[in-house]
């Protein structure tokens, strides 16, 4: 389906509003340090050019690829070399190498100030004064901080952001209306960004076969009534969509996502009974709804898998002649029967099944060799079940903050070389699994927990890749996508680690501690906890608990004092000395 002008094709398909939004997101994800105004200028220039191509597809440069057009535009930025350094060298390359070069320079942890939320009245005034600019600013600020954010989904977030302001800026109590909505959007946005980052990592580091396997398992759980051929078609289309978005081809990605939503809604009967309510919604909402749709009910009387995958005389023949189809069907059949398993577990089972066939099929008696293959799954299934059970018990016993602290200690002991901010961020997020998943019924716990942990651990992998410091982290991150979580779980105290020298400055606190929000106070305390463990990796739970309890008491005491700063100056060194003694 070739078009004379790709840019005209996408402009017509997407419409001006979505076209402009997506180009802004694309540019902001590539040039994360550029000021907002610069990006708006570039977007307007591209949009005007697109309009000339819509009017006349044969006009000059209209036949160029989107990468060429966008790359040329990005390379006109005057401050490229001083702002981005070696990224400016990308501009000397030809497509497709230039785009690959830009992709490689995307920064998962850009040095940007945290977004500060202004007063509600200030935000409402800005919204009313110039709604378009206000919403573009939102797209820009999110995209530059999350360079792999799923672009069509970001348009959906922006639509919700707009709706929240439209509704709440009219309300009697603006803040009570708006702030919970903004909090929800922020939290959902961070989760969405992290989930998409895992998809892109899967595609970029492990190839499209890894992503397709993930998609077969997940879609088979969601759509257990759909035929394998139907699931395969959805997987192929979904892989194309995510490959495009992860590759910076945001216009194509959004266009193909819309086509996929259209196809799903036109073929509901052969996919799932749960799609009805999604399909009445407008495009952005519809696509989001379809992506989040609950699992359909499993068909009644599904036969045992053993007949086709253990007992059949054709198992080895089918495996050898078309592994992708045969193992894909195995994964589909297993996943549709097991909505109670995590996708990662299902992928491990498929991998174990494949390994058994590869080992057995050339043997003298293949069937005897692989007859007990399903029994071999048991330990693989029990491992995440036990992990979820133990950690949910710990979470219920400790509560979220102390559960996070337990994970902070656990992970700092495993990989003490990792930077403290990364350990705090990752462990805090790992700790959120409790509140997110432990309240769910048994059948939903494992898929919730393990697949969430995969997303969080991917963040660790992505940050570590930028600044590698631990061979153990590199090994767990690169060897196997599906075994990342078990790999990290299996890590023990790093005996080779040389404890960090004690630095009193790290444990010096000031009165500003008292004005911090509860979350910020927690982060400060958790930062201190990580540093303690790095200093004394063999400290016992009891020792660390004692120090942390003393720390909380010391902070509470000084924050109640009349002269807070004097209290911190006097009590701080005492706390440090007592802590050193307790950990000696």
């Amino acid at each position: 389906d070739t078009h004379k002008s790709e840019v005209a094709h996408r402009f017509k398909d997407l419409g001006e509003e979505h076209f402009k939004g997506l180009v802004l997101v694309a540019f902001s994800q590539y040039l994360q340090q550029c000021p907002f105004e610069e990006h708006v200028k570039l977007v307007n220039e591209v949009t005007e050019f697109a309009k000339t191509c819509v009017a006349d597809e044969s006009a000059e440069n209209c036949d160029k690829s989107l990468h060429t057009l966008f790359g040329d535009k990005l390379c006109t930025v005057a401050t490229l070399r001083e702002t981005y350094g070696e990224m400016a060298d990308c501009c000397a390359k030809q497509e497709p190498e230039r785009n690959e070069c830009f992709l490689q320079h995307k920064d998962d942890n850009p040095n940007l100030p945290p977004l500060v939320r202004p007063e509600v009245d200030v935000m409402c005034t800005a919204f009313h004064d110039n709604e378009a600019t206000f919403l573009k600013k939102y797209l820009y600020e999110v995209a530059r901080r999350h360079p792999y954010f799923y672009a069509p989904e970001l348009l959906f977030f922006a639509a919700r952001y707009k709706a929240a302001f439209a509704e709440c800026c009219q309300a009697a109590d603006k803040a009570a209306c708006l702030l919970p909505k903004l909090d929800e959007l922020r939290d959902e946005g961070k989760a969405s960004s992290a989930k998409q980052r895992l998809k892109c990592a899967s595609l970029q580091k492990f190839g499209d076969r890894a992503f397709k396997a993930w998609a077969v398992a997940r879609l088979s759980q969601k759509f257990p009534k759909a035929e394998f051929a139907e699931v395969s078609k959805l997987v192929t289309d979904l892989t194309k969509v995510h490959t495009e978005c992860c590759h910076g081809d945001l216009l194509e990605c959004a266009d193909d996502r819309a086509d996929l939503a259209k196809y799903m809604c036109e073929n509901q009967d052969s996919i799932s009974s749960k799609l009805k309510e999604c399909c009445d919604k407008p495009l952005l909402e519809k696509s989001h709804c379809l992506a989040e749709v609950e699992n359909d009910e499993m068909p009644a009387d599904l036969p045992s898998l053993a007949a086709d995958y253990v007992e059949s005389k054709d198992v080895c023949k089918n495996y050898a002649e078309a592994k992708d189809v045969f193992l894909g069907m195995f994964l589909y059949e297993y996943a549709r029967r097991h909505p109670d398993y995590s996708v990662m577990l299902l992928l491990r089972l498929a991998k174990a099944y494949e390994a058994t066939l590869e080992k057995c099929c050339a043997a003298a008696d293949p069937h005897e060799c692989y007859a007990k293959v399903f029994d071999e799954f048991q330990p693989l299934v029990e491992e995440p079940q036990n992990l979820v059970k133990q950690n949910c018990e710990l979470f219920e016993q400790l509560g979220e903050y102390k559960f996070q602290n337990a994970l902070l200690v656990r992970y700092t002991k495993k990989v003490p070389q990792v930077s403290t901010p990364t350990l705090v961020e990752v462990s805090r997020n790992l700790g959120k699994v409790g509140a997110k998943c432990c309240k769910l019924p048994e059948a939903k716990r494992m898929p919730c927990a393990e697949d969430y942990l995969s997303v969080v651990l991917n963040r660790l992998c992505v940050l570590h890749e930028k600044t590698p410091v631990s061979e153990k982290v590199t090994k767990c991150c690169t060897e196997s996508l599906v075994n990342r979580r078990p790999c990290f779980s299996a890590l023990e105290l790093d005996e080779a680690y040389v404890p960090k020298a004690f630095n009193a400055e790290t444990f010096t606190f000031h009165a500003d501690m008292c004005t911090l929000s509860e979350k910020e106070k927690q982060v400060k305390k958790q930062t201190a906890l990580v540093e303690l463990v790095k200093h004394k990796p063999k400290a016992t739970k009891e020792q660390l608990k004692g120090v942390m309890d003393n720390f909380a008491a010391f902070v509470e005491k000084c924050c109640k004092a009349d002269d807070k700063e004097a209290c911190f100056a006097e009590e701080g060194p005492k706390f440090v000395a007592a802590s050193q003694a307790a950990l000696a």
Partner: antibody
Framework: EVQLLESGGGLVQPGGSLRLSCAVS????????INWVRQAPGKGLEWIGI???????FYATWAKGRFTISRDNSKNTVYLQMNSLRAEDTAVYYC???????????????WGQGTLVTVSS | DIQMTQSPSSVSASVGDRVTITCQSS???????LSWYQQKPGKAPKLLIY???KLTSGVPSRFSGSGSGTDFTLTISSLQPEDFATYYC???????????FGGGTKVEIK
């Protein structure tokens, strides 16, 4: 010492047939998968097919129909039957064992010394 | 259609040199089913590396393999006189019938 020894090569007319043998010594052939691989003079390696221990066979797409692999475990020998031979089938033909523990991977750890087949009128 | 492209087709090097041979597959090989063989004139090939990076027992550690998916590399860190030979990569795919070798790379004395 484990050895694979090919025999049966020689000069054959276009359109003719030939049966190559691969005699295995030092191991019990009945437990192993054996492949046939050929190499035209001055050219690269070309996989022909495999016979698993169970007797199941698979062939390269180009070899299906003209080439047949069989085995006789009592004689510890694997055979390659070649029909409708053409000039382009001229090559050294090797038998090779698949590394134990693999079934479909291209890992061949033991090779014969090869036998030359020349197809010419 | 399966394509297994090896490059370069020949390389001239001296003893002690580092030699790198690449193998590009289309489509990607199945599950890192990638092997490297060494063949000397008039002899049968010898398996050096399997699963893209695992050394066969008895193969010197100067040989190493890396890569995944579509792009693979065989590296000889310090070429020895006995390493002058032709090297082949071998790939396994979704269908066993697609098992293929690369075109070969001849490592010659400079």
């Amino acid at each position: 010492e484990v050895q694979l020894l090919e025999s049966g090569g020689g000069l054959v007319q276009p359109g003719g047939s030939l049966r190559l043998s691969c005699a295995v010594s030092g191991i019990d052939l009945s437990n192993y998968a054996i492949n046939w691989v050929r190499q035209a003079p001055g050219k690269g390696l070309e996989w022909i097919g495999i016979i698993w221990a169970s007797g199941t066979t698979f062939y390269a797409t180009w070899a299906k129909g003209r080439f047949t692999i069989s085995r006789d475990n009592s004689k510890n020998t694997v055979y390659l039957q070649m029909n409708s031979l053409r000039a382009e089938d001229t090559a050294v033909y090797y038998c090779a064992r698949t590394v134990p523990g693999y079934s479909t991977a291209p890992y061949f750890d033991l090779w014969g010394q090869g036998t030359l087949v020349t197809v010419s009128s | 259609d399966i394509q297994m492209t090896q490059s370069p087709s020949s390389v001239s090097a001296s003893v002690g040199d580092r030699v790198t041979i690449t193998c590009q597959s289309s489509p990607s090989v199945w599950s890192n089913f990638l092997s490297w063989y060494q063949q000397k004139p008039g002899k049968a090939p010898k398996l050096l590396i399997y699963e893209a990076s695992k050394l066969t027992s008895g193969v010197p550690s100067r040989f190493s393999g890396s890569g995944s998916g579509t792009d693979f590399t065989l590296t000889i860190s310090s070429l020895q006189p006995e390493d002058f030979a032709t090297y082949y990569c071998g790939g396994g795919y979704s269908s066993i019938s697609d098992t293929t070798f690369g075109g070969g790379t001849k490592v010659e004395i400079k």
